[in-house]
Amino acid sequence: KFSKQSWGLENEALIVRCPRQGKSSYIVDWYYSQTNKSIPTQERNRVFASGQLLKFLPAEVADSGIYTCIVRSPTFNRTGYANVTIYKKQPDCNVPDYLMYSTVSGSEKNSKIYCPTIDLYNWTAPLEWFKNCQALQGSRYKAHKSFLVIDNVMTDDAGDYTCKFIHNENGANYSVTATRSFTVKDEQGFSLFPVIRAPAHNETKEVEIGENTNLTCSACFGKGAQFLATVQWQLNGNKITDFSEPRIQQEEGQNQSFSNGLACVNTVLRIADVKEEDLLLRYDCLALNLHGLRRHTIRLSRK
């Protein structure tokens, strides 16, 4: 539990966190276990300690070994061990098993591949992604923050995915790569282009001036759990939050699952004390998922 394996490639940055976590105010001392030699904290060193982190900028094969971190609170000292292995760069495309991070599984409705260990680094978007060493291109691949999203995942999307990013330390840039396998699960669920159940397109609803009224936007997106499925209202093409009228409020979407297994979401628009000017507005029910956007419009009329 308090000994952690870390690995990297020579000439790349490697940052390792002390497996023994403590409060951020605690002092952390790092040592090279074999020699009990203290790791310096000065950033001019290629290998230096920075609180909970041990930084190899860049790493060399000779850095391999066990590093001890001692986390010191005012009254307690607690020890952790980082087992670091630095490998030579592979001449060919194959990524050996010992360089692979944990395998992740995905399906059509959940195809996120997180870039391993990236939270330890000072990086800026976008990430570069490769599959079996080929740069990923095409609209199906979306690099978002620290993960990759694949649209319409198919079984042949399985494979080894490598993320590549730049770590910046005091103005100097260092490359980092990390690889993990992605497997595709064949699930019973599926997602469809959104189907709006209510309101009907170009519907008109009769309302009483001065009364309260509710408009329900209800849409279905397929079967089973959905990766992305949102239902919301717009007023004259604007988000409700951008429309500064406190009488008109949108409830958070409520998930519904019908007996036929359809995954649907309902979002209610509440209008208090209906006024004449509300009859002039265009109310758009929007349903959005990875397949696209569908819009139904409803207007209000006086009863």
């Epitope: 539990k1 308090f2 976590q21 403590g22 409060k23 609170s73 009254t75 307690f76 607690r78 020890t79």
Partner: antibody, heavy 123, light 106 residues
């Protein structure tokens, strides 16, 4: 000097309620996770509940879940234990204690304890 | 929950003798184990944390060892003030205590 002082114990009927307090001093209260531990007469120690520092996340032993509520007022340096639906088996000395280390999701030892307050549940 | 079993329930020894107390966990707790001493009418006092580290101010005659599921508290030479009840506590998964070992004067 770190001090923890429990109060609020006493005799209560089964099904009744009681609120224990623990006044802390001598350390930055809001930073530390705080714990209630109890000890039935002549028996061993039993962890009851933990509350995180600023985050305020709470954890309970199965034996008290749904009946007891741990809370804290960092502005008053005070820890509380609201005990509802009390049973005879809740009779014990209740100690408040400090966890000097924990980070979110982990637990550690208890380095300072109060002197305890006796709760007796009896008709 | 993780169950801690302490043995023996009672240990009868004379001052100056060596005391060996055992604590066994129902599943591995790594080194997330502590030992406490409790005297009648007092709150427990922390002796050992992380299985083998002495807490501040604890005399060197107290030592802890073990990891995983089997742990030992050793008092190398009992002093009169060491006669008390000793509890082990795990903090690997929430918190549980052993039922205690009473060290009494023979």
């Amino acid at each position: 000097e770190v001090q923890l002082l429990e109060s609020g114990g006493g005799l209560v009927q089964p099904g009744g309620s009681l609120r224990l307090s623990c006044a802390a001093s001598g350390f930055t209260f809001s930073v530390y996770d705080m714990i209630w531990v109890r000890q039935a007469p002549g028996k061993g120690l039993e962890w009851v509940s933990t509350i995180r520092g600023e985050g305020g996340g709470t954890y309970y032993a199965d034996s008290v879940k749904g009946r007891f509520t741990i809370s804290r007022d960092n502005s008053k340096n005070t820890l509380y234990l609201q005990m509802n639906s009390l049973r005879a088996e809740d009779t014990a000395v209740y100690y408040c204690a400090r966890d000097p280390w924990s980070t979110e999701g982990s637990f550690f030892v208890l380095d300072y304890w109060g002197q305890g307050t006796l709760v007796t549940v009896s008709s | 929950e993780i169950v801690l079993t302490q043995s023996p329930a009672t240990l009868s020894l004379s001052p100056g003798e060596r005391a060996t107390l055992s604590c066994r966990a129902s599943q591995s707790v790594d080194d997330d184990l502590a030992w406490y001493q409790q005297k009648p009418g007092q709150a427990p006092r922390l002796l050992i944390y992380d299985a083998s580290n002495r807490a501040t101010g604890i005399p060197a005659r107290f030592s802890g060892s073990g990891s995983g599921t089997d742990f030992t508290l050793t008092i190398s030479s009992l002093e009169p003030e060491d006669f008390a009840v000793y509890y082990c506590q795990q903090y690997n998964d929430a918190i549980t205590f052993g039922q205690g070992t009473k060290v009494e004067i023979k």
